[in-house]
Interface confidence: low
């Protein structure tokens, strides 16, 4: 079953390569287990950036080596992606799945265009 997911259209990463955005979903029911996946679309290729499953009211748990962190509050997920470089500029799509209890719901956002600008190297000081 389809579910609406909202996310900002554009986000500019910080000079340290960190970008944060909110992914909000319109939950049709009272889900207790939610899975959030961030996918990057660039040049018609779609790749999974990170994913986390969480129980409502608990913290999101990404893999240890994940470049993502996040927190949840109600039907909002605050996502942060770290270690971004200019080459990582692209459309980052938030995918939300209500895993339990049934029925299963799937929602896909329109994507957040994240722009990453590599900082100019600091000139050597004498």
């Amino acid at each position: 079953k389809a579910m609406h997911v909202a996310q900002p259209a554009v986000v500019l990463a910080s000079s340290r390569g960190i970008a944060s955005f909110v992914c909000e979903y319109a939950s049709p029911g009272k889900a207790t287990e939610v899975r959030v996946t961030v996918l990057r679309q660039a040049d018609s290729q779609v790749t999974e950036v990170c994913a986390a499953t969480y129980m409502m009211g608990n913290e999101l748990t990404f893999l240890d080596d994940s470049i993502c962190t996040g927190t949840s509050s109600g039907n909002q997920v605050n996502l942060t992606i770290q270690g971004l470089r200019a080459m990582d500029t692209g459309l980052y799509i938030c995918k939300v799945e209500l895993m339990y209890p049934p029925p299963y719901y799937l929602g896909i956002g329109n994507g957040t265009q994240i722009y990453v600008i590599d900082p100019e190297p600091c000139p050597d000081s004498d």
């Epitope: 899975r35 996946t37 779609v46 994913a51 995918k95 799945e97 895993m99 299963y104 799937l106």
Partner: nanobody, 135 residues
Framework: EVQLVESGGGLVQPGGSLRLSCAAS????????IGWFRQAPGKEREGVSC????????YYADSVKGRFTISRDNAKNTVYLQMNSLKPEDTAVYYC????????????????????????????WGQGTQVTVSS
């Protein structure tokens, strides 16, 4: 424009084999799921098999497990359904269908089989090819 064209159907005797092809255009198979479905006269369309483009996972309906094999050729952008040991009850119009990878759920095993073999999960459909198993 997404297009799916099935071929390879025909009349075959019980115990015989057929290979169906589903030629896709307008997209690449890499991030799509392609499913095979069939519909016999007076019956609902039922899922037969599916291959998920992102990782190549395959799913089969219990009624065809061990007899049917789904595969894909990315270079030809084509998905195949090899059907062996055909039975009269396999007689139906066979359709291939596609759904974009973003719409694929994070379900594996039995849950995945259930989702991928549901006709309502798919967005694009071919016109179908008739398979008749009769002596």
């Amino acid at each position: 424009e997404v297009q799916l064209v099935e071929s390879g159907g025909g009349l075959v005797q019980p115990g015989g084999s057929l290979r169906l092809s589903c030629a896709a255009s307008g997209f690449t198979l890499d991030y799509y799921a392609i499913g095979w479905f069939r519909q016999a006269p007076g019956k609902e369309r039922e899922g037969v098999s599916c291959i998920v483009g992102s990782d190549g996972s395959t799913y089969y309906a219990d009624s065809v497990k061990g007899r049917f094999t789904i595969s894909r050729d990315n270079a030809k952008n084509t998905v195949y359904l090899q059907m062996n040991s055909l039975k009269p009850e396999d007689t139906a119009v066979y359709y291939c269908a596609a759904v974009h990878g973003l719409k694929l759920p994070t379900l594996r095993g039995l849950g995945g089989s259930y989702y991928y073999l549901q006709a309502r999960s798919y967005d694009y459909w071919g016109q179908g090819t008739q398979v008749t198993v009769s002596s």
